[in-house]
Interface confidence: low
């Protein structure tokens, strides 16, 4: 009785065991053994197939078979079969087992392949706690990750198998902490159409850190009030808070802050001016007397109710420009003019502080001529020390 | 613990005011925002407004601008809050919250009892 | 201003089961997002602040999660206590606002 069978394989290799006796023998039944232990059973000459033989397959085996009569009792050779690893338990390393927050990592699963067997294909997936990272299986044993967050803290292992599946080996657990940086050195900054802030027009809050990793949580105050008024939790080193129409009320003192989990850090306060355009100005006219005559000195007051200083307003007769005056302090300003005749007709003014001009109504005036004579068909109407009515 | 105990339900004609109270215990007054909630019959949560109980600066909803006041006592550690020209829409259950400590953000982590306001001619 | 809208209105399940609540925003409100639970005849109680984080003392088959407009509350096996409506609320940056959805009621079957 001959047991035929290889005397060395590899992990993932069919065995077959083959147990040969001479034909004209008559059993009643047959057996394989391995270690003296009875491994399978049959009722007439077979063959025995491991599958896909595991490093546990090495060891001692041997045929028996059972006769119709005693003497027919036989065993065959015993072969010792040593199944030999195709790779090693892959190692998990990594660029960094510390990585800080915000920055890349490289995983690598690192395995060997039997010298005799360098032909064999290997795929890797990577793990991190129970979940697959990158795209699952692949040829390559290095996975980058382009950022790491504080929340990819954890266990991570790697597996690596034959690409025909017959054999999977997993590396140990290893643990990766990610260290998260402090923020440091918040800014506030505004930015605004033209550089200045300006009413009615938009405002950004522009919140930065130097600094820090991971989620940051932006928050912006008023100094005065004291109160938040947005807030912004995003992976980056500045947020923006849009004030879509700036209004007078919003002048103040502002301030910023910024915490992505350790000790929130606060900007220097900023003062915010809100520069007010020009309001459409009112043109009073004043003269000595209650007509308004040639020879006269006849007074131009021109005032914008609302607006940043300084207003330069500009007088104009019959779109003419007879003089400007400027109010560094906001206010009006005036204008003097001796009166001939003519002068008659429309007057008005121009207010103008660098965020736009606005002009006044018109204001039409008739001069009385030195013989008592008006100039023109209509009256202005002018008292002393009053506007001058329209004519 | 922390408490919040509002003041009794109250029944208002229309064109009234009512004024709810809210007393705190179980923690620094001053250090947290008490916001005010309502809730309608069968309808959601409608926030009102709230006061910065540190330094007394209020926010209100702009659907109750110029009808409702916020106001606080922080020697008798009480917040208050007072409806004008009530109509027989604003019969609701009224609630006083006080703004989490948790998260950056306005949630509310105690609330008040509530107090039903009736409004009926 | 920013409009929550919850479903579905009501979710019929039984103890032991999985429940999914969904909050859309009508525009990004970042994760500024918190879940409360109403008994009838009491107090909103605070579960979900900043999408999903738990508050103080909620037990942990409740978790949030979501960020931008869609947001998630899932109880991941319901106890009898747990049959109530459901808000999510939002406070959005400029103007400063909060508003509530129109609620979730999560009923026995």
């Known amino acids: 009785l001959t047991l035929v069978a290889p005397s060395s394989v590899f992990e993932g290799d069919s065995i077959v065991l083959k147990c040969q006796g001479e034909q004209n023998w008559k059993i009643q039944k047959m057996a394989y053994h391995k270690d003296n232990k009875e491994l399978s059973v049959f009722k007439k000459f077979s063959d025995f197939l491991i599958q896909s033989a595991v490093l546990s397959d090495s060891g001692n085996y041997f045929c028996s078979t059972k006769g119709q009569l005693f003497l027919w009792d036989k065993t065959s050779n015993i072969v010792k079969i040593k199944v030999q690893e195709l790779f090693q338990r892959p190692v998990l390393t990594a660029s960094s087992f510390q990585p800080i927050e915000g920055g890349p990592v490289s995983l690598k699963c690192e395995t060997r392949l039997s010298p005799q067997r360098l032909d064999v294909q290997l795929q890797f997936c990577f793990f991190r706690e129970n979940q697959v990272l990158g795209s699952g299986w692949s040829s390559s044993p290095e996975l980058q990750i382009s950022a790491v967050w504080s929340e990819d803290t954890g266990s991570y292992w790697c597996k690596a198998e034959t690409v025909t599946h017959r054999i999977r080996k997993q590396s140990l657990q290893s643990q990766i902490h990610v260290q998260r940086i402090p923020i440091s050195n918040v800014s506030l900054e505004i930015r605004a159409p033209g550089g200045q802030v300006t009413e009615g027009q938009k405002l950004i809050l522009l919140c930065s850190v130097a600094g820090g990793t991971g989620n940051v949580t932006f928050s912006w105050y008023r100094e005065a009030t004291g109160t938040s008024m947005g807030k912004k939790t995003q992976r980056s080193l500045s947020a923006e808070l849009e004030i879509p129409a700036v209004k007078e009320s919003d002048a103040g003192k502002y301030y910023c802050r910024a915490d992505n989990g350790h000790v929130p850090i606060q900007s220097k306060v900023v003062n915010i001016p809100v520069r007010i355009p020009v309001s459409r100005p009112v043109l009073t006219l004043r003269s000595p007397g209650a007509q308004a005559a040639v020879g006269d000195l006849l007074e131009l007051h021109c005032e914008a109710l609302r607006g940043s200083p300084p207003i330069l307003y500009q007088f104009y007769h019959e779109d003419v420009t007879l003089g400007n005056s400027s109010a560094p302090s906001g206010g009006g300003a005036s204008f003097n003019l001796s009166l001939t005749a003519e002068h008659s007709g429309n007057y008005s003014c121009e207010a103008n502080n660098g965020l736009g001009a606005q002009c006044s109504e018109a204001v039409p005036v008739s001069i009385s001529g030195p013989d008592g004579y008006r100039r023109d068909l209509m009256t202005a109407g002018v008292t002393e020390t009053s506007q001058v009515a329209p004519a | 613990q922390v408490q919040l105990v509002q003041s009794g339900a109250e029944v208002k004609k229309p064109g009234a005011s009512v004024k709810v109270s809210c007393k705190a215990s179980?923690?620094?007054?001053?250090?947290?925002?008490m916001h005010w909630v309502r809730q309608a019959p069968g309808q959601r949560l409608e926030w009102m407004g709230w006061i910065n109980v540190g330094n007394g600066n209020t926010r209100y909803s702009q659907k109750f601008q110029g009808r409702v006041t916020i106001t606080r006592d922080t020697s008798a550690s009480t917040a208050y809050m007072e409806l004008s020209s009530l109509r027989s829409e604003d019969t609701a259950v009224y609630y006083c919250a006080r703004e989490g400590s948790n998260g950056w953000h306005e949630d509310f982590d105690y609330w008040g009892q509530g107090t039903l306001v009736t409004v009926s001619s | 201003e920013i409009v929550l809208t919850q479903s579905p209105a009501t979710l019929s399940l039984s103890p032991g089961e999985r429940a999914t609540l969904s909050c859309r925003a009508s525009?990004?409100?970042?994760?500024?997002l918190a879940w409360y639970q109403q008994k009838p005849g009491q107090a909103p109680r605070l579960l979900i602040y900043d999408a999903s984080n738990r508050a103080t003392g909620i037990p942990a088959r409740f978790s949030g999660s979501g960020s931008g407009t869609d947001f998630t509350l899932t109880i991941s096996s319901l106890e009898p206590e747990d049959f109530a409506v459901y808000y999510c609320q939002q406070r959005s940056d400029w103007p400063p606002s909060l508003t509530f959805g129109g609620g979730t009621k999560v009923e026995i079957k």
């Open positions: 525009q990004s409100v970042s994760s500024y």
């Open positions: 179980g923690y620094t007054f001053t250090s947290y925002a």
